[in-house]
Amino acid sequence: MKVLQEPTCVSDYMSISTCEWKMNGPTNCSTELRLLYQLVFLLSEAHTCIPENNGGAGCVCHLLMDDVVSADNYTLDLWAGQQLLWKGSFKPSEHVKPRAPGNLTVHTNVSDTLLLTWSNPYPPDNYLYNHLTYAVNIWSENDPADFRIYNVTYLEPSLRIAASTLKSGISYRARVRAWAQCYNTTWSEWSPSTKWHNSYREPFEQH
């Protein structure tokens, strides 16, 4: 049994880091493998993560952490029974994938304006809380070409757009994702999408 693709890990910079790797053949990850992880700190102890299958030869493990700070470094040991298959380290702050925003809501009751709001996925005491920026994706269910991205570079989790920038009388969907420049993170996953019917009063044409 050998590791084909070494574990790569990303952290949500809160409580979970996710590590993925591939074995050289079909593997029952949960029965055959264990990933041991330990914070490099005098008084820390090793924790065991039981991996799950992620495709035939792929494994994924969700490492639980109390919290994360920039200085944290973890040692990782991948074991198959008594055999050490791989040894490495992981610094969560250097491999951050933020949590996806939640509670995306489209408020259509503001005259001719669409107000999209969502929730910051981090509590106020987390470092990323004040460092997230967002991308909002809006697309038409009827027209695949009607697909747009709005970059929200301010901290407030909301976006206002004129309803008239979208077509009237058709249904749209929106979703939002986050990233943090400070840690050069990857983008989060997209939030679940939300749907609304776009309708607004066309202004009278002037001749």
């Epitope: 005098l42 008084l43 700070v69 920039s70």
Partner: antibody, heavy 116, light 111 residues
Framework: EVQLLESGGGLVQPGGSLRLSCAAS????????MAWVRQAPGKGLEWVSA????????YYADSVKGRFTISRDNSKNTLYLQMNSLRAEDTAVYYC?????????WGQGTLVTVSS | QSVLTQPPSASGTPGQRVTISCSGS????????FNWYQQLPGTAPKLLIY???HRPSGVPDRFSGSKSGTSASLAISGLRSEDEADYYC???????????LGGGTKLTVLG
């Protein structure tokens, strides 16, 4: 709410022994390393000893090595410090502290006086 | 003699910014993060800063920490009378498997 309550302090003669206890509540005791820190009257803080969450690894300051023993009972949520061969310079308030990277919660301390 | 050196005293007037330094001796290993503790008169110490610059919840953002090599500093802005206390720096010394603490700095708020 995290609470640490030390007990067992008192007056003891040089060469004598004392056992300090620290009762913990408000958090999962078995998941946290713990430590003892002391403060002699009018002096600064001095780290004494620390123990990992399971009790498998233990560390001592040179000044107490061989005389003090730290231990824990995770079923009772209690940390202990057995102090033998006590000296006058061990006179101090002894604080028990929870460890999360640093000493993030402290008890109110118990006074140990070593005097003849 | 502590391997972490702090000035024995510091002072400032209300509203001022005060900085307290904590210097590791030349041979001190540059490995562990620095922590800062506040001890108000007659009370137990309280964690103020951990992992160089992180504040536990409930600690005002007037307190900030930074690290450079084997030294660290604690800054207190908008000084208040209730900040009058002893301040200690500390770090884990991985070379000797111990925790080391500075000698403490007594902060006086004048006026």
């Amino acid at each position: 709410e995290v609470q640490l309550l030390e007990s067992g302090g008192g007056l003891v003669q040089p060469g004598g022994s004392l056992r300090l206890s620290c009762a913990a509540s408000g958090f999962t005791f078995s998941r946290h390393a713990m430590a003892w820190v002391r403060q002699a009257p009018g002096k600064g803080l001095e780290w004494v000893s620390a123990i990992t969450a399971s009790g498998r690894s233990i560390y001592y300051a040179d000044s107490v090595k061989g005389r003090f023993t730290i231990s824990r009972d995770n079923s009772k949520n209690t940390l202990y410090l057995q102090m033998n061969s006590l000296r006058a310079e061990d006179t101090a308030v002894y604080y028990c502290a929870r460890v999360h990277r640093a000493f993030d919660y402290w008890g109110q301390g118990t006074l140990v006086t070593v005097s003849s | 003699q502590s391997v972490l050196t702090q000035p024995p005293s510091a002072s400032g007037t209300p509203g001022q910014r005060v900085t307290i330094s904590c210097s590791g001796s030349p041979l001190f290993p540059d490995s562990g993060s620095f922590n800062w503790y506040q001890q108000l008169p007659g009370t137990a110490p309280k964690l103020l800063i951990y992992a160089d610059s992180h504040r536990p919840s409930g600690v005002p953002d007037r307190f900030s920490g930074s690290k450079s090599g084997t030294s660290a500093s604690l800054a207190i802005s908008g000084l208040r009378s209730e900040d009058e206390a002893d301040y200690y720096c500390g770090t884990w010394d991985y070379s000797l498997n111990r925790y080391v603490l500075g000698g403490g700095t007594k902060l006086t708020v004048l006026g």
